[in-house]
């Protein structure tokens, strides 16, 4: 059965947008006007995982690219990366755990918790133009809250 997907952009709670930084990295920075076209459009797929009223498992692919955000151990630390996949096989309803994020809605803000590494979240730095990363703390300096903007197909 086909997987359900939607197109969207994400901004952190400081209104920083996400853009490509080289072939396999995202960074967060403030964009305005025509520069907004640089922000990445995600294809968010609804996949297998723990589901409840405020928690929905998703995979975050880059629209029309065979790249997905994934969580892996690098030097024994949970790390966020962009991983290339075979477009013939993705997206699928049952994604490997490293691709799965628990989309958690709290007070109209979204958090994206790694299914592979519980309590690790897609995060941005307070500073401008820094990589998007997987962070193990909430409510500290780093930003783990996002808003989602729907993009028409």
């Amino acid at each position: 059965a086909p997987v359900r997907s939607l197109n969207c952009t994400l901004r952190d709670s400081q209104q920083k947008s996400l853009v490509m930084s080289g072939p396999y990295e995202l960074k967060a920075l403030h964009l305005q006007g025509q520069d907004m076209e640089q922000q990445v459009v995600f294809s968010m797929s609804f996949v297998q995982g723990e589901e409840s009223n405020d928690k929905i498992p998703v995979a975050l692919g880059l629209k029309e690219k065979n790249l997905y955000l994934s969580c892996v151990l690098k030097d024994d630390k949970p790390t966020l990366q962009l991983e290339s996949v075979d477009p013939k096989n993705y997206p699928k309803k049952k994604m490997e755990k490293r691709f799965v994020f628990n989309k958690i809605e709290i007070n109209n803000k979204l958090e994206f918790e790694s299914a592979q590494f519980p309590n690790w979240y897609i995060s941005t730095s307070q500073a401008e133009n820094m990589p998007v990363f997987l962070g193990g703390t909430k409510g500290g300096q780093d930003i783990t809250d996002f808003t989602m903007q729907f993009v028409s197909s």
Epitope: A1, Q48, G49, E96, K97
Partner: antibody, heavy 119, light 106 residues
Framework: QVQLQQWGAGLLKPSETLSLTCAVY????????WSWIRQPPGKGLEWIGE???????NYNPSLKSRVTISVDTSKNQFSLKLSSVTAADTAVYYC?????????????WGQGTLVTVSS | QSVLTQPPSVSVSPGQTASITCSGD??????AFWYQQKPGQSPVLVIY???KRPSGIPERFSGSNSGNTATLTISGTQALDEADYYC?????????FGGGTKLTVL
Amino acid sequence: QVQLQQWGAGLLKPSETLSLTCAVYGGSFSDYYWSWIRQPPGKGLEWIGEIDHSGSTNYNPSLKSRVTISVDTSKNQFSLKLSSVTAADTAVYYCARASPSSGWTLDYWGQGTLVTVSS
Amino acid sequence: QSVLTQPPSVSVSPGQTASITCSGDKLGDKFAFWYQQKPGQSPVLVIYLDNKRPSGIPERFSGSNSGNTATLTISGTQALDEADYYCQAWDSNIEVFGGGTKLTVL
């Protein structure tokens, strides 16, 4: 409380078509996937395939050429047909529900129907 | 299609801890599920998404999954836990079951 009740012919001859139906009582029909699993006597479980309320299917490749799973949302029922059966298809056949709240796995099962293929 | 391998049988004394393993290539990168089946009955889901218990399943049932191995652990095993146990995961959107483990409570 969700209940799955299944029925169908229990004795078939080789080359005939197995036909089973599963009725779902309680709970929404459209929010789930609906699966068939079989278990040969004294052996393990084998997944046959699944369907959602819209009729979208996913089959085990080893059986795909012979299997058809269909759905009748007006009756909250789904059905299994397996063509050209042989003695190797003798098994207890189960219908089951796959739920999003349990990670799209099989949280409710029917009572099982023993299907015997013998000439 | 991947293969999930379970030991055919595991024995445990009442009150002791039983561990049933399920091995498969990169199984830890997938979600694992466990079912209990008693003779003449339909399977019952006891663990889902590696380590979560459905309502009604006793706390003595727990699960873990990493590397190539998922493990079902039953602590304080009781006579009523005697049953066949099946692991399940997926491969290319196909559900795959392990061969089953008969748990005997001595």
